[in-house]
């Protein structure tokens, strides 16, 4: 008789999830010499152990601690790029500017990027049919707790000038409910971080408004200032041209004419 299975509102575990995590781990450790010591089978076992046989609405940060320990990685603390609702551009930027790092440029972020996973209480099965949705079902689900945990640690590690890319096309350029707004902002360490510099990325070709004056950016500035961290903001009016100039800063069109 087939067992009754909980039906969640969100999509199920990404197909071939175990194979994908293992393959990503192997690829990452081959490309990054400083992580060559990592045993990918142990990483997968720790990842699996965080959510298998557990109720997918009852996951804690503690469940991920063995994985966090195995994935411990030192990134230059002054080269951190956070992002909110503009992941693709942030990743394009760090692919060109190789000394800057988003969370997804670290081993743990790379393993889980764009994946979904969950298990079932009291069985060793992975649920490929459905997983809890953060809003409709529960917030303490395996995916949300994972990203909350790694995002918190990433923000805690940051120092000096921390950069964040924000999407200027959104109605809320800074969203208090995003991972950046709810986790990372509150875990920057004022004794280590001097400045948070926001880059507001414009969407429209002819959009020359100063989006640094947006009420949500002022709200971010207020939160950051209250935490004794300086705040700075820049409009990136032409993200396409900006990336081109990051790739080739010597191009004459990338320097102001005298």
């Amino acid at each position: 008789v087939p067992r009754w299975r909980q039906q969640w509102s969100g999509p199920g575990t990404t197909k071939r999830f175990p194979e994908t995590v293992l393959a990503r781990c192997v690829k990452y450790t081959e490309i990054h010499p400083e992580m060559r010591h990592v045993d990918c089978q142990s990483v997968w076992d720790a990842f699996k152990g965080a959510f298998i046989s557990k109720h997918p609405c009852n996951i804690t940060e503690e469940d991920y601690q063995p994985l966090m320990k195995l994935g411990t990685q030192t990134v230059p603390c002054n080269k951190i790029l956070l992002w909110s609702r503009i992941k693709d551009l942030a990743h394009q930027f760090t692919q060109v500017q190789r000394d800057m790092f988003t969370l997804e440029d670290t081993l743990l972020g790379y393993l889980a990027d764009d994946l979904t996973w969950c298990g079932e209480f009291n069985t060793s099965k992975i649920n490929y049919q459905s997983c809890p949705d953060w809003r409709k079902d529960c917030s303490n689900n395996p995916v949300s707790v994972f990203w909350k945990t790694v995002s918190r640690r990433f923000a805690e590690a940051a120092c000096d000038v921390v950069h964040v890319m924000l999407n200027g096309s959104r109605s809320k350029i800074f969203d208090k409910n995003s991972t950046f707004g709810s986790v990372e902002v509150h875990n920057l360490q004022p004794e280590k971080v001097q400045t948070l510099e926001a880059w507001v990325i414009h969407g429209g070709r002819e959009d020359s408004r100063d989006l640094c004056q947006d009420p949500t950016i002022k709200e971010l500035e207020s939160i950051i200032s209250k935490r004794n961290i300086q705040f700075s903001c820049k409009n990136i009016y032409r993200p396409d041209k900006f990336l081109q100039c990051v790739k080739n800063p010597e191009d004459s069109s990338c320097t102001s004419e005298i």
């Epitope: 800057m100 100063d210 640094c212 100039c245 990338c254």
Partner: nanobody, 119 residues
Amino acid sequence: QVQLVESGGGLVQAGGSLRLSCVASGIIFRIFSMGWYRQAPGKQRELVATITSGGNTNYAHSVKGRFTISRDDAKNTVNLQMNSLKPEDTAVYYCNVAIPSGIVDRSAWGQGTQVTVSS
């Protein structure tokens, strides 16, 4: 928002020299061209020298041969060596990115450093 701190200005006689220095924090300043700008009383701010991240330099006609811009990315600094100073060089000097403003804004200016050249 103290990301650009200029120093080294002062009062100097015509024909004298000064070395301006600017400490710039943030990745934008490391990746892109940097420039020294100046603003004389009652005049518009003008760009007098630029240096790309690769070290290529460009100068305004009025300062060519007298001013030299340099950068040290390890120390996050941009310098302006000013020789054979003239009274018309009197201005507040600022450093900032020298990217066309249609790409990235230059909203965050430092306090500048005053250069006064007496005749």
